[in-house]
Amino acid sequence: GSGIFQLRLQEFVNQRGMLANGQSCEPGCRTFFRICLKHFQATFSEGPCTFGNVSTPVLGTNSFVVRDKNSGSGRNPLQLPFNFTWPGTFSLNIQAWHTPGDDLRPETSPGNSLISQIIIQGSLAVGKIWRTDEQNDTLTRLSYSYRVICSDNYYGESCSRLCKKRDDHFGHYECQPDGSLSCLPGWTGKYCDQPICLSGCHEQNGYCSKPDECICRPGWQGRLCNECIPHNGCRHGTCSIPWQCACDEGWGGLFCDQDLNYCTHHSPCKNGSTCSNSGPKGYTCTCLPGYTGEHCELGLSKCASNPCRNGGSCKDQENSYHCLCPPGYYGQHCEHSTLTCADSPCFNGGSCRERNQGSSYACECPPNFTGSNCEKKVDRCTSNPCANGGQCQNRGPSRTCRCRPGFTGTHCELHISDCARSPCAHGGTCHDLENGPVCTCPAGFSGRRCEVRITHDACASGPCFNGATCYTGLSPNNFVCNCPYGFVGSRCEFPVGLPPSFPWVA
């Protein structure tokens, strides 16, 4: 602790100019004071001035008023500094002396004589308020006031708390009257050395080095560092933790760039046709009658469905068609015949059977022929039997479907997983992509099928910290760290929410 006992002398009265022994001063009492401050004593005794002592120069003769003086000799109030915790009690002895000698240093003069002395014992709290008192004896009167104040940078009721205002990286504060710290705006913590970050800045994922700042830790972004950064190259995906790529609905693949729902995203099928997804970026359009083309974008001629029977020729009209019937046939579709079996109406070896008592007939066609008169060669591809873009081919009495890569089955209706063949060596993970399978290799292997042993393993150097698991082949850096709970960062190097430590103090 550290403080100052201050004594202000105000007026001394010794009208008769007498000494304590009854003698008078000639020509008058040239008066100076000796002050002794010590610990509280119920009965004041001689002995060391434990709290300090001070003497004044000659302040006046006999009776006089003492003016305040801030510097030099004769300073008033008198200062008695101490370097300990103020106990709250004290004993004070004020002696008035006459000197025949030097005005400025009367202490050193021989022949000094006591005029009077007063003793004060009691309690005194630290404070700015002066306590005023007056002491009389038969010959003299002394008016004075006193107080105890703390030295600069000392605070509290006993001046025991040291506090120095500060504005540097070890603290940003001012001192309260009790010596506690009052943080400057924008700062917090026991020593006001912790900045208050931008309001809302994420506690774990953001930090600041000065007030109203929000600096993101690796893997986080946004004004408040509350948005994770997804895996580099993530196209149609999001993250809930950094470096993740969780695919949006309808997307797949490591980087969520494989379209699994082309029909919904692109609506490729026109004219009310039905769209069916068939793997990444694959789809098939099933056309309504009257349309054709890969996307059912082509409108068919009204005659395209061959509505005219018995070899009738079809002619397109604005919203309809017209059948020109061959001799022996009539009706809208030439469906009625004036022929009988006698006219040998069945072609290509068809057998004629009479009906309705010989007034009409029906042809029974040999294999590969059809039509009322067996006049048409059967085209087994007209029903578009091949799914998923397969090509239909007539093969004599039958037809076959030639499937696109990735499909199989009689009608190309089955989707082949490229990964079914387990193309990835050395425990690599297989991903079905549009252009074929892609392998994600375990540590120590690379190549399209993980067939190449890496001499330098990116994980071999142990780039991941705090017990994280290392994977290669997932990122441009050749490795990705999977962090354990409580750690973040591209190498799991940042602890989440660091607890303050409590180092030793003396």
């Epitope: 600069d152 940078n153 040291l162 120095k164 205002k165 504005d167 540097d168 990286h169 070890f170 603290g171 913590g189 020593y191 050395d193 912790q194 930090y207 600041c208 080095s209 000065k210 600096i215 602890p495 660091l498 303050p500 430590s501 409590f502 180092p503 103090v505």
Partner: antibody
Framework: EVQLQESGPGLVKPSETLSLTCTVS??????????WGWIRQPPGKGLEWIGD???????YYNPSLKSRVTISVDTSKNQFSLKLSSVTAADTAVYYC?????????????WGQGTLVTVSS | EYVLTQSPDFQSVTPKEKVTITCSGQ??????ASWYQQKPDQSPKLVIY???KRPSGVPSRFSGSNSGDDATLTINSLEAEDAATYYC?????????FGQGTKVEIK
């Protein structure tokens, strides 16, 4: 017990960059109670404060060296580093790393043993 | 630029004697002063922080004070093991500043 250990080349050519690393063991460099500083002492002379760093990366440098000094921190390795560019013979000194304690009002309670760096061609 | 000046530069003292080293700087009393002891070929060691406090393990004969423009390190009853160079240190804003050092030698 906290320990600090300086490492780096003992000889650097004039005009090149001096690089030193201080490895902290027995305590976390990420504690909010400490700054991590560099101090140097030319042979037969007194101590000169170079600069310090907080675990978040905030740095403070001696104005007389500021244009040439870079201090960085790697919390994952519990290390902090000093780079001093364009060195001359006047930069020959024992370089110390130290822990500056907020609770001790900036007093440095732990020091490395120091490493002598000589600048000479 | 803030400057700390120590006096004396050198002091030769007999054992059991009292040693006083002064560190002066403009309004130094408004800053916290630390004192370091450095023996030959050793790192500095903190002996006083926050003007007058001793870290654990530092003998009670070491004491410090700081007011006005002067901080003082006092070694009461010097012992042979106290022979060293002593440095005062304070912070001026965000910059650490050391005094030039005082070498204490045993007579």
């Amino acid at each position: 017990e906290v320990q600090l250990q300086e490492s780096g080349p003992g000889l650097v050519k004039p005009s090149e960059t001096l690089s030193l690393t201080c490895t902290v063991s027995g305590g976390s460099i990420s504690s909010s109670s400490y700054y991590w500083g560099w101090i140097r002492q030319p042979p037969g002379k007194g101590l000169e404060w170079i600069g310090d760093i907080y675990y978040t990366g905030s740095t403070y440098y001696n104005p007389s060296l500021k244009s040439r000094v870079t201090i960085s921190v790697d919390t994952s390795k519990n290390q902090f580093s000093l780079k001093l560019s364009s060195v001359t013979a006047a930069d020959t000194a024992v370089y110390y790393c130290a822990r500056e304690d907020v609770i001790l009002r900036g007093g440095s309670d732990y020091w490395g043993q120091g490493t002598l760096v000589t600048v000479s061609s | 630029e803030y400057v700390l000046t120590q006096s004396p530069d050198f002091q030769s003292v007999t054992p059991k004697e009292k040693v006083t080293i002064t560190c002066s700087g403009q309004r130094l009393g408004d800053k916290y002063a630390s004192w370091y002891q450095q023996k030959p070929d050793q790192s500095p060691k903190l002996v006083i922080y926050e003007d007058s406090k001793r870290p654990s393990g530092v003998p009670s004969r070491f004491s410090g004070s700081n007011s006005g423009d002067d901080a003082t390190l006092t070694i009461n009853s010097l012992e042979a093991e106290d022979a060293a160079t002593y440095y005062c240190q304070a912070w001026d804003r965000d910059t650490g500043v050391f005094g030039q050092g005082t070498k204490v030698e045993i007579k």
